[in-house]
């Protein structure tokens, strides 16, 4: 196991997950850690505890390794980091990777007020409701700018979008969470259509899909541990 030293001179590795940081309960996920070609060992940590290690074979590419989680559960959802060793030196820690398990317990209802088809500039609010009490709700947009909004609430949360622009059009789903990394089943999708303006923008995004595998999240992380360029909207106003 890696020993903490003050002289962690090697650059930190990059960590990411495939196919997504959001994994349906029982499904598999790959966690990749990319360090250096000279790396002799990679170590993966989960919630601060030693999780797995890999010693890459010289015959293969040694600058990255894959850790396979065969069945994602609430016990494997949380924060992962990785390190690598080269010679006697260890790297700094990677940025944290937050893995979320979905498909737990119940399915929320999602609807939009005043209606799914609105004119440019109209005020729109999404509502997410879950029968089983939860602590937080998440609203996600498919195939778009990967916005994730979250709101605290017991059985319902509202997500005011304000005056909508064409950037708001697209397909949305919501989740209830039992903790930050354990989420409900996804709601049925709601597609927001925007009409009006100079051009006819009422078309929904092409090829909308109900599969979470098609959600395009940027899986690299920044210093805060949030997904870079995901434009997390962290509204924590109490309902």
């Amino acid at each position: 196991q890696r020993i903490n030293t003050e002289k962690e001179t090697l650059p930190k590795p990059i960590i990411w997950a495939k196919p997504s940081i959001m994994v349906t309960n029982g499904n598999s996920v790959n966690i990749w850690c990319q360090g250096a070609q000279s790396a002799s060992e990679y170590q993966l940590y989960f919630e601060g505890s030693f999780f797995a290690l890999e010693r890459p074979k010289p015959s293969r590419s040694m600058n990255k390794v894959r850790f396979f989680i065969s069945q994602m559960t609430s016990h494997t959802a949380g924060i992962y980091t990785c390190f690598y060793q080269s010679g006697e030196l260890w790297s700094k820690s990677s940025n944290p990777l937050k893995l979320v398990v979905t498909g737990l317990y119940d399915t929320p209802n999602l609807w939009v007020y005043p209606r799914p088809e609105v004119t440019l500039g109209e005020n729109v609010t999404f509502f997410c409701q879950l029968k089983t009490a939860t602590s937080k709700f998440f609203l996600l947009k498919e195939r778009g700018s990967n916005h994730i909004q979250n709101k605290y609430g017991n059985i319902q949360a509202e997500f005011p979008m304000g005056p909508v622009t064409r950037a708001h059009r697209g397909t949305y789903r919501c989740f209830g969470s039992y903790n930050d990394y354990a989420w409900s089943f996804p709601s049925e999708p709601v597609t927001l259509l925007i009409t009006g303006g100079v051009e006819n923008s009422s078309l929904a995004p092409t090829d909308p899909t109900s599969s979470l595998d098609y959600w395009e999240f940027d899986l690299s992380t920044n210093e805060s541990g949030l997904q870079k360029d995901s434009a997390f909207w962290d509204h924590t106003t109490q309902n």
Epitope: F50, F51, P56, R66, F68, S70, T73, H75
Partner: nanobody, 126 residues
């Protein structure tokens, strides 16, 4: 579905040896990473040793140099050879598997394992 059955436990004197076996059902054994964990009375389950599908191994500091993990893919079995046993090694020993896995990953955390045996008791006493 994978089933794991441990055997080889028993009572032994300090300094003695035992070999635990874990027989796995199914044809996926060669693609499994395997591990041994133990739980002493009144304590939490702890990692003992693990082996990757490509025979890389890793040991808890407390057993390093005394215990050896190995596998025989032809027999679908993983072994834990225990020597220089101490009173503090007394515990129920569990075999666990990560099925499937890839590469040469060695899993140390119990949450990584998706199949578990029922355990075999090892008692070390004079």
């Amino acid at each position: 579905e994978v089933q794991l059955v441990e055997s080889g436990g028993g009572e032994v004197q300090p300094g003695g040896s035992l070999r635990l076996s874990c027989a796995a059902s199914g044809r996926t054994f060669a693609s499994a990473a395997m591990g041994w964990f133990r739980q002493a009375p009144g304590k939490e389950r702890e990692f003992v040793a693990a082996i990757s599908r490509s025979d890389d191994t890793y040991y808890a500091e407390s057993v390093k140099g005394r215990f050896t993990i190995s596998r025989d893919n032809a027999k679908n079995t993983v072994y834990l050879q225990m020597s220089s046993l101490r009173a503090e090694d007394t515990a129920v020993y569990y075999c666990a598997a990560v099925v499937p896995t890839y590469g040469s990953s060695i899993y140390v955390h119990s949450a990584a394992y998706n199949y578990w045996g029922q355990g075999t008791l090892v008692t070390v006493k004079p």
